[in-house]
């Protein structure tokens, strides 16, 4: 008996699909980086499964992940950020599946925040601004942002605008008058680093003014 696998033999365990995906977040907590991995199949029995990362680390050869419910997580300063690391799913000492990954190619930025929309009556436009923690970071500074907005009644009819700054102007004439809009923003690495879209920021809601019948313009909010 191997002693590794409970709830069935290790041979049975090897038939399961242990494919997983990971994302990194650099300087997510001061100078600390994080790495989060999860199985692609939510039905995998994770009872005895552990994750380990080896290689491209500082002062250690390997690190073990912490298990947080369905995800596996590391927060550390010890990522070299040069070269590929080997991330393995393990049962005891046995590796079930491994991936060689450069952590700078799976970066998921932090979600933007402080999204707001201000109507400029004189300019007949809306100024959208938001903030990102990445402006203060040493590594993942340059992001592409995706601003998405929709009329609240249009469930899946989002309009997307890509931009590299944290300010966007929406022309009043492009929006429906006297309508409630929802707007949100997310970010992705755009220079040197590769990876995934961040989570969406919290949505912001704003109403467009009525049309002023005499001038054909909208009333301010």
């Amino acid at each position: 008996e191997s002693g590794y696998a409970q709830n069935g033999d290790l041979e049975d365990a090897e038939l399961d699909d242990y494919s997983f995906s990971c994302y990194s977040q650099l300087e997510v907590n001061g100078s600390q980086h994080s790495l989060t991995c999860a199985f692609e199949d939510p039905d995998v029995n994770i009872t005895n499964l552990e994750f380990e990362i080896c290689g491209a680390l500082v002062e250690v050869k390997c690190l073990n992940f912490r298990k947080l419910q369905e995800i596996y997580f590391i927060e550390t300063k010890k990522f070299l950020l040069i070269g590929k690391s080997n991330i393995c799913v393990k049962v005891g000492e046995k590796s079930l599946t491994c991936k060689k990954i450069d952590l700078t190619t799976i970066v998921k930025p932090e979600a933007p925040f402080d999204l707001s929309v201000v109507y400029r009556e004189g300019a007949n436009d809306f100024v959208v601004t938001f903030n990102t923690s990445h402006l203060q970071k040493k590594y993942v500074k340059v992001l592409m942002h995706d601003v998405a907005y929709r009329q609240e009644k249009d469930e899946n009819k989002w309009t997307h605008v890509n931009l590299s700054s944290t300010k966007l102007t929406l022309l009043q004439r492009k929006l429906q008058p006297a309508a409630m809009y929802e707007i949100k923003v997310r970010s992705i690495p755009d220079h040197y680093f590769k990876g995934f879209w961040s989570e969406w920021s919290p949505s912001y809601y704003f109403r467009t003014p009525e049309i002023n019948n005499s001038s054909g313009e909208m009333d301010p909010i």
């Epitope: 070299l80 070269g83 450069d102």
Partner: antibody, heavy 117, light 110 residues
Framework: QVNLRESGGGLVKPGGSLRLSCAAS????????MHWVRQAPGKGLEWLSL????????YYADSVKGRFTISRDNTKNLLYLQMNSLRAEDTAVYYC??????????WGQGTLVTVSS | NFMLTQPHSVSGSPGKTVTISCTRS????????VQWYQQRPGNSPTTVIY?????PSGVPDRFSGSIDSSSNSASLTISGLVTEDEADYYC?????????FGGGTKLTVL
């Protein structure tokens, strides 16, 4: 098959400059960490510099920091080493090396740089 | 910064076994992987051991690597010596974002 070929070496006077190139083929260049290592005549290996896959991360040995600059052009599969303020002690065979997928490196055949008046 | 110290030279007869040591001056030898390179005269280096004890494909199993925490050193052992093993051997470790090479050991096959 991994192939690395250095060029640009030669004779240069002290205080002069030289740019070495390393042409890469047989592997995914824009996925690889690259290094420059040198070997003075009859001496051991000395690591000089590395560059990350994207050019963002660059690091140097103290002996060349401020004088040498590593760079890469992923569109052409080329690695460079710009060497300024050269000294007699910089005379060596210069190798480019690929850092494999967290295993052994692959090395070029080297190019000789001679710094002499 | 640490140094990796190797004996200047070792020798052995064909068929015999030799061991080349690589001692780290400060910090733990366990803190990053050790690689070993072989450099035959007039050639560029090639990897014979990576990740402490792993052999690249094509390297004979006569080559083995190990780590000894108690002596803070790594070792390269070559058994069944043949004349083609005559070369310089270098150990190497990462030191943060720098690479540190040992001074090299000349192996002579008598």
């Amino acid at each position: 098959q991994v192939n690395l070929r250095e060029s640009g070496g030669g004779l240069v006077k002290p205080g002069g400059s030289l740019r070495l190139s390393c042409a890469a083929s047989g592997f995914t260049f824009d996925d690889s960490v690259m290094h420059w290592v040198r070997q003075a005549p009859g001496k051991g290996l000395e690591w000089l510099s590395l560059v990350g896959w994207d050019g963002f991360f660059t690091y140097y040995a103290d002996s060349v920091k401020g004088r040498f600059t590593i760079s890469r052009d992923n569109t052409k599969n080329l690695l460079y080493l710009q060497m300024n303020s050269l000294r007699a002690e910089d005379t060596a065979v210069y190798y480019c090396a690929r850092q494999g997928d967290y295993m052994g490196n692959n090395w070029g055949q080297g190019t000789l740089v001679t710094v002499s008046s | 910064n640490f140094m990796l110290t190797q004996p200047h030279s070792v020798s052995g007869s064909p068929g015999k076994t030799v061991t080349i040591s690589c001692t780290r001056s400060s910090g733990s030898i366990d803190s990053s992987y050790v690689q070993w390179y072989q450099q035959r005269p007039g050639n560029s280096p090639t990897t014979v051991i990576y990740e402490d004890d792993q052999r690249p494909s094509g390297v004979p199993d006569r080559f083995s690597g190990s780590i000894d925490s108690s002596s803070n050193s790594a070792s390269l052992t070559i058994s069944g010596l043949v004349t083609e093993d005559e070369a310089d051997y270098y150990c190497m470790q990462y030191d943060f974002h720098h690479l540190v090479f040992g001074g090299g050991t000349k192996l002579t096959v008598l």
